[in-house]
Structures are given as structure tokens and as C-alpha cells.
Amino acid sequence: TLNSVLNSNAIKNLPPPLGGAAGHPGSAVSAAPGILYPGGNKYQTIDNYQPYPCAEDEECGTDEYCASPTRGGDAGVQICLACRKRRKRCMRHAMCCPGNYCKNGICVSSDQNHFRGEIEETITESFGNDHSTLDGYSRRTTLSSKMYHTKGQEGSVCLRSSDCASGLCCARHFWSKICKPVLKEGQVCTKHRRKGSHGLEIFQRCYCGEGLSCRIQKDHHQASNSSRLHTCQRH
């Protein structure tokens, strides 16, 4: 129930002491290193790890990717799986843990020694000459945004939406992914079922923009076979 959710959070996630500062949003506060709020653990363990159902990598955590749990299993059932470490087999970048990427079916390091050239073999665009390193906490696919240095414009190759400029998302286009515009009000959108059927999409659409959601178009004049058309509509 909602109450149990809220009560559990009231225990686990306590804000800083109120002390009257709340009326002054200009000041910032953060958890000091080593301070744990009741029930909170800054260094989250995965002892109680529960596989989470997903439809795409972006629904998973930064150390996970979305796939069928069994090799050759039902493509309709996907969960978030732990990312693959260096030298493990992979089929796409998202399968590799942060600081790595998928090259020739193997997860390899994306540190500055290997970084240049290797990725440019897999992404055929020029992204400048600066040699950036990846910090250990970055999302594995911020590897691409750190490589590009400027956010990808429409049509740029990307790995994740965070690689793309504001107003764009990273979506499949044939067998690669490119930055495409986030959908505006009235534009046709794809309402994904939880089973992850859109993994088969060749031309993936972006999600709806801020303040919009993908809902069935309530147009009674449409033919019955197109009555399932979804468009981006105001909340």
C-alpha cells in the first residue's frame, strides 16, 4: 500500500535536520561522507538484489543492462541483468560495465590509453582530439558524451540519451542509434508494453517531451484498425 511505502521511506530516507533553513533554497546541503541516514547505506550492497523487469537499458541501473535472462529465451520477458566486466562477451555497449565498451564482442576498457581509435572504429565520426578519462562513477555510456565533448546534435551517433543535446533522445535507427527529437504535443508516439516488444523496432521513436505523456488518441472518426494510435498529450 501507499502508506507502507511512505512509512518505509520515512524511516530510510530522512532529510537533513530542519533548523529553519528550508525557507532559503539558495543554500545547499549534502550527506557528508560516512554519514548514513537511518536505514540508508551510501555504499549500496546487492545482497537483497531483486531482478527488475525492463523494456530497455535505460530503465535499468547504471551497472545493468536489459535482456532476456536465459540465452535464446523468450524475448518478451526481459529483466535488468548485471553488467559484464572487462574481457567478458558482449553484443552491445550497454552490456559492459562503466568504464568499458563492447568491441568485437568483448568488453574492453575505455581508459585513455585504448580510448582513441578503438571507439572510432565502431563509431565512424570525428569527435575532436581531447583525451578525456572516465571517472569511475559515470554511467557507462557517458563514455560517449565524454568522447564527443559536445552533446550530439540530431542525427549524431549515440549510445544513450545523455549523449544527445537537450531536446533530443538516443533512439534506434536501423542497427545503430542516433539522436532524434523528443516528441512534441500531437506527434505519434509508441506506447511500449512492459514485455519489451519494442526491442524489435528498427526505427525507434523518442519519448514525449516534458509535460506530455503517450496516450491513446481519442478520435472516434478513425477507422477501427487505427484506433490504437497513440499521441503525445498534455497531462
Epitope: L6, A31, G40, K42, Y52, E58, E59, G61, T62, Y137
Partner: nanobody, 125 residues
């Protein structure tokens, strides 16, 4: 380490709207979950809404569903909370919080370890 600063709070009449922002400093924001919590006078703080690192997943408490919208722009290190059709019972101090999003779970179940100072939202009848 992530530092969070909320803005956009204020006084509004019932039925009105407010837009809160939560701006983060620190490189970890784009790989962090973000949640909005609130605490009304004399009440326990409650989880209002959350969004995962990519924006692909969101969660809303029943009390705000259909009225509040959470979003984020990782390029700007900012999360947003659009609040419409506000009610007097929405009056509270609103906190933005974040935590590492390494392993997916229900957005109400994350450990939110970094907190903003809070911004006051007052809805008058």
C-alpha cells in the same frame, strides 16, 4: 559527492501551479536517481515522486498522480517538478534528493543520500 539546490517554491492559490527545480553540482548527477520528498508541519516526510538516471522510469505517490510531473535534463544537471492543480494539503517543505542508481528497483526504495536544503511551498485556500 552531489550538492543539490532547490528553487521555485512560493505562495500560490489553490488550483494554481508551481515549477520546482533541483540543480546539482558534481559529476555523479547523470548516473543518479532523483526523488522529491515533502514534509508538512507536524507530519512525517513523504516520498512524492522519483525518476531514474535516464528519465525512462518515473513513480508518483497516489496523492499527486495526474497533477505533478517529474522530469530531468542531465545536460543541465537539473531535475524538475511541475505541480498543477495545487491543493492546500500540498503545503510543505519540498526536498530534492538523489542517490546512486546502480541497480534498478522501485523508485520509492532507493537510498537517497544527498539532500537539498528544501524549498517552501504554501497553497492558500
Amino acid at each position: 559527492e552531489v550538492q543539490l539546490v532547490e528553487s521555485g517554491g512560493g505562495l500560490v492559490q489553490a488550483g494554481g501551479s508551481l515549477n520546482l527545480s533541483c540543480t546539482a553540482s558534481g559529476s555523479a548527477f547523470s548516473s543518479s536517481v532523483v526523488g522529491w520528498f515533502r514534509q508538512a508541519p507536524g507530519k512525517e516526510h513523504e516520498f512524492v515522486t522519483g525518476i531514474n538516471w535516464s528519465g525512462a522510469r518515473t513513480y508518483y505517490a497516489d496523492s499527486v498522480k495526474g497533477r505533478f510531473t517529474i522530469s530531468r535534463d542531465n545536460a543541465k544537471n537539473t531535475a524538475y517538478l511541475q505541480m498543477h492543480s495545487l491543493k492546500p494539503e500540498d503545503t510543505a517543505v519540498y526536498y530534492c534528493a538523489s542517490g546512486r542508481d546502480r541497480y534498478a528497483r522501485d523508485l520509492s526504495e532507493y537510498e537517497y543520500v544527498w539532500w537539498g536544503q528544501g524549498t517552501q511551498v504554501t497553497v492558500s485556500s
